[in-house]
């Protein structure tokens, strides 16, 4: 299988100069890093930072949103060392986690106001915050937290270079005063659980203090990474040894300790993926280990199965897993040795951006009941990373992407198999964004970010689909790239579409081109399946190219015809002639099958020999439905682009156009009178149908109505009849 | 940059009373909540008294209530603790601190800043 590329679709969108100065202020002293990331939340925002300065910017034009610059109490400025998306009582804004001399300062800004509206002391060097929860108090929204943590109005988990892990109260139920950084409040940390959480809580506060309950004491090993998982109502957190624990927050205990394959290498992210329908109350957890840009050169990817007692759906809809039974490595992926042929020595391979997508069935589609707990049919991960190699002055740059339902579909392999690349595995998808880098360089990239909305495996080529479809290698999608000079936006197409697109591209020599693309189509699985156990060499050039067409129509890839036609009519040449007779038979007789097609699915419809039409048969007579637009469309581009036809040619041509158009609405109705409960007919003419489309009596009344107001306008002169 | 300067320190008898001052610089104390601490001789720091922002509130370490009075003056910018009725225990060195990070029982695992420090010395 060919590489999969990475398009970029927009020019450089540069941050504005004013962000570009304040970032740039601070990059001379040596402690200060250019961090950015996008923010993980719906509001489409990336924060970059650099030293005591903070820029927010819009994730889409690279606009400038909010800025500020920390001051500290210290003679060196503080250092923002953590930023996390938050939003609470309608505001939206962030946690920020500042590095001084002497601890570490929390801050709540509000994005609104371009301000600090909280700040607390933290002991140590924060190196990682997550919201846990952005409200308070013992309601049902909290149930799923420990006793002790309801009391307080907001935690965020806090963890620092020492190990410390600490849960903070972040009175959000008292925010009658603005304070900024320098006015931060004191902090009391309690470690275990006192059982008059309110009591001391009320006492901390009006001493000007926030209360915090300490996880773990400090151990002398750095926290890496830090995530809560909503639906399983876990703390993950990584160590720099290559631990990884996962902490319960209902019971406030750690359920799980354990040291990941690659050994003492950092725990630099977690995400977390769930599978659609696992009847053993299972999901997922990968833990990347990365030594970044320090010594050594690893970067792995593990996966973790976590297998729970219960699954739940709550009032608020969201799913709850409880009752770990147990945690157990399923897969690794080793990113820097050779998993993958790359030419040369690698040097140094860093993770850029890990991120998990779900896409939920719409309600008209599930069988579930309401009530159900759903999962995602949907469910892939993201991960993006840089390889430098020696020698070489450009990075190169991945995408990969895990799809876990094809995962578990290849009998959830522990690894790749011997001789299995990355990019012809079944699960899992690679993408070269070398022309990111190309058009980019030599801005450092800080991270990627797909789109989820975008995400998408485009029009079957056929009923069932072929196995080829549900690859992940099929996904289209677009993604933006956080540079340190502003944003760019790239697409990621699948096998099939980028296949359609050579095709597309081939153009006038596409006589060439058959056996390339006919091969192309039929491994990326655009063709039919009676062709998938035939020898392309046993097909002559005429059957390869009905079999592309077939292919452009069923996916709706009209614009390859179309091209093709054009073309043909306005550069003659040798060929031009028998391909445009060709591809014009082709497209009648194919009308004249789907038509036949659609007439056979339809019998049951009028002979009253049944009640109801099976989703199988609707969805077959909407793809007949579907062909017919799309021949439509071709014969519509022969009429309106023939010339030097004779008189006979061009009846014939505009007779074929209104026959299929003609077709194509009589199809449509059809749908309709189905759709509407008014088709399949029934033999028993007063069988009540379950619902009309149209109200009588409000039309009736309607009418009346009108009637009345004519005759009294025209004074008895107007004649209804 | 925030400085603390305390000054007042000496050595007394028991009973006696002292009065210490901690000037600030870079920072204002009508807008911070502050705090006296203290390290007896071989101890961690302890927290002695806070005086909130707007000069309200005023609390106090069990060992030193009814006792110690920790007050400020907006317009010197400058914090005081009166200790009245000294016990040899109380002898440390007596800092005034900003942005206190401590467990339940008082003890303070960190400071964000403060000065460096007058003793106080309570004879016998």
């Known amino acids: 299988m060919r590489d999969l590329r990475a398009q970029v679709t927009s020019g450089l969108l540069p941050f504005p100069e004013v962000t570009l100065q304040a970032l740039g202020e601070d990059e001379i002293t040596l402690e200060s890093v250019l961090r950015g990331k996008f923010a993980a939340g719906k509001n489409g925002l990336a924060c970059l930072a650099c030293g005591p300065q903070l820029e927010v910017v819009n994730s889409i034009t690279g606009e400038r949103l909010s800025a500020y610059r920390f001051s500290g109490v210290n003679e060196q400025p503080p250092v923002v060392l953590a930023v996390k998306e938050f939003s609470w009582q309608k505001r939206t804004g962030l946690l920020i986690g500042l590095e001084e001399t002497e601890g570490s300062v929390l801050c709540l800004y509000d994005l609104g106001i371009s301000k600090v509206v909280k700040a607390v002391v933290l002991p140590g060097r924060v190196t990682a915050i997550e919201p846990i929860i952005n409200h308070g108090g013992a309601s049902a929204s909290t149930q799923h937290l420990h006793p002790s943590l309801r009391w307080l109005f907001g935690v965020a988990a806090v963890v620092t270079d020492v190990g410390q892990i600490l849960l903070v109260d972040l009175c959000l139920d008292d925010l009658s005063c603005n304070q900024n950084e320098v006015e931060a409040s004191d902090l009391e940390v309690l470690t275990g659980i006192p059982a008059e959480v309110p009591h001391i809580r009320e006492s901390v506060m009006r001493q000007g203090r926030h209360l915090c309950f300490q996880l773990v004491s400090p151990t002398g090993t750095a926290v890496s990474t830090l995530s809560y998982i909503s639906r399983t109502n876990q703390l993950a957190v990584g160590f720099s040894d290559g631990y990884l624990a996962l902490w319960n927050m209902k019971s406030m205990k750690r359920e799980y300790y354990i040291q990941l394959e690659s050994g003492q290498v950092p725990v630099y992210a977690v995400t977390f993926q769930e599978p659609e329908n696992d009847p053993r109350n299972c999901c997922y957890l990968w833990a990347v280990q990365s030594t970044q840009d320090s010594e050594g050169d690893v970067l792995s990817l593990h996966l973790l199965q976590l297998a729970f007692g219960n699954r739940k759906c709550l009032a608020s809809g969201q799913i709850l897993y409880e009752g770990l039974e147990y945690c157990e490595e399923r897969y690794t992926l080793d990113l820097t040795g050779g998993m993958f042929p790359l030419r040369g020595q690698t040097s140094n391979t860093k993770l850029l951006g890990c991120q998990s997508i779900e896409k939920f069935r719409s309600h008209g589609d599930r069988e579930e009941g309401v009530n159900e707990a759903l999962s995602p049919d949907t469910s892939v991960s993201v991960f993006t990373w840089q390889v430098n190699i020696y020698g070489q002055g450009k990075p190169s740059v991945y995408l990969g992407l895990f799809d876990i339902n094809r995962w578990y579909h290849a009998q959830m392999p522990d690894s790749l198999r011997s001789g299995e690349y990355l990019h012809n595995c079944s699960y899992f998808a690679l993408w070269s964004l070398e022309s990111v880098v190309s058009r980019t360089s030599p801005h450092g990239i800080l991270d990627i970010l797909v789109h989820e909305r975008s995400l998408n495996r485009g029009v079957p080529p056929s009923y069932p689909p072929p196995e080829q479809f549900f690859n992940p290698s099929t996904y289209n999608f677009d993604a933006t790239c956080l540079l340190n000079s502003g944003v760019v936006h790239l697409t990621c197409t699948g096998f099939q579409k980028e296949t359609l697109t050579f095709l597309k591209k081939s153009g006038p020599s596409l006589n060439e081109l058959i056996p390339d693309g006919y091969n192309r189509c039929l491994v990326a699985g655009l063709l039919s399946p009676r062709f998938v156990d035939v020898q392309p060499s046993s097909l002559s050039q005429e059957e390869q190219l009905e079999a592309i067409l077939s292919a452009a129509i069923q996916t709706s890839s009209l614009g390859l015809l179309t091209g093709y036609i054009r073309r043909w009519i306005t550069e003659e040449q040798p060929n031009s002639a028998t391909n445009l007779r060709f591809v014009l038979e082709w497209t009648w007789n194919k009308v004249v099958l789907t038509k036949e097609e659609f007439d056979r699915l339809c019998v049951p419809l009028f002979d009253g020999s049944c009640h109801f039409m099976d989703p199988q048969t609707i969805q077959s007579i909407q793809q007949c439905y579907l062909l017919l637009s799309n021949l439509n469309i071709v014969l519509s581009c022969f009429a309106s682009e023939a010339r030097e036809i004779t008189e006979r040619g061009l009846i014939d041509l505009s007779n074929k156009f209104v026959v299929s158009h003609l077709i194509c609405q009589y199809a449509q109705v059809v749908l309709w009178f189905s759709h509407s409960g008014l088709l399949p007919e029934g033999i028993d003419d007063s069988v009540q149908l379950s619902r009309l489309c149209y109200n009588y009596p409000v039309i009736q009344n309607y009418y009346t109505s009108r009637r009345q107001k004519f005759e009294r306008l025209s004074r008895g002169k107007w004649n209804p009849d | 940059q925030v400085q603390l300067v305390e000054s007042g320190g000496g050595l007394v008898h028991t009973g006696d009373s002292l009065r210490l001052s901690c000037a600030a610089s870079g920072l204002d104390l009508s807008r911070v909540g502050i705090s006296w601490i203290r390290q007896p001789p071989g101890r961690g720091l302890e927290w002695v008294a806070k005086i909130l922002a707007d000069g309200t509130g005023a609390f106090y370490a069990d060992f030193v209530k009814g006792r110690f009075t920790i007050s400020k003056d907006s317009t010197k910018n400058t914090l005081y603790l009166q200790m009245d009725n000294l016990d040899a225990e109380d002898t440390a060195m007596y800092y005034c601190?900003?942005?206190?990070?401590?467990?339940?029982?008082?003890?303070?695992?960190?400071?964000?800043?403060r000065g460096q420090g007058t003793q106080v010395t309570v004879s016998s």
């Open positions: 601190a900003l942005g206190l990070v401590q467990d339940s029982q008082g003890l303070v695992l960190s400071s964000r800043a």
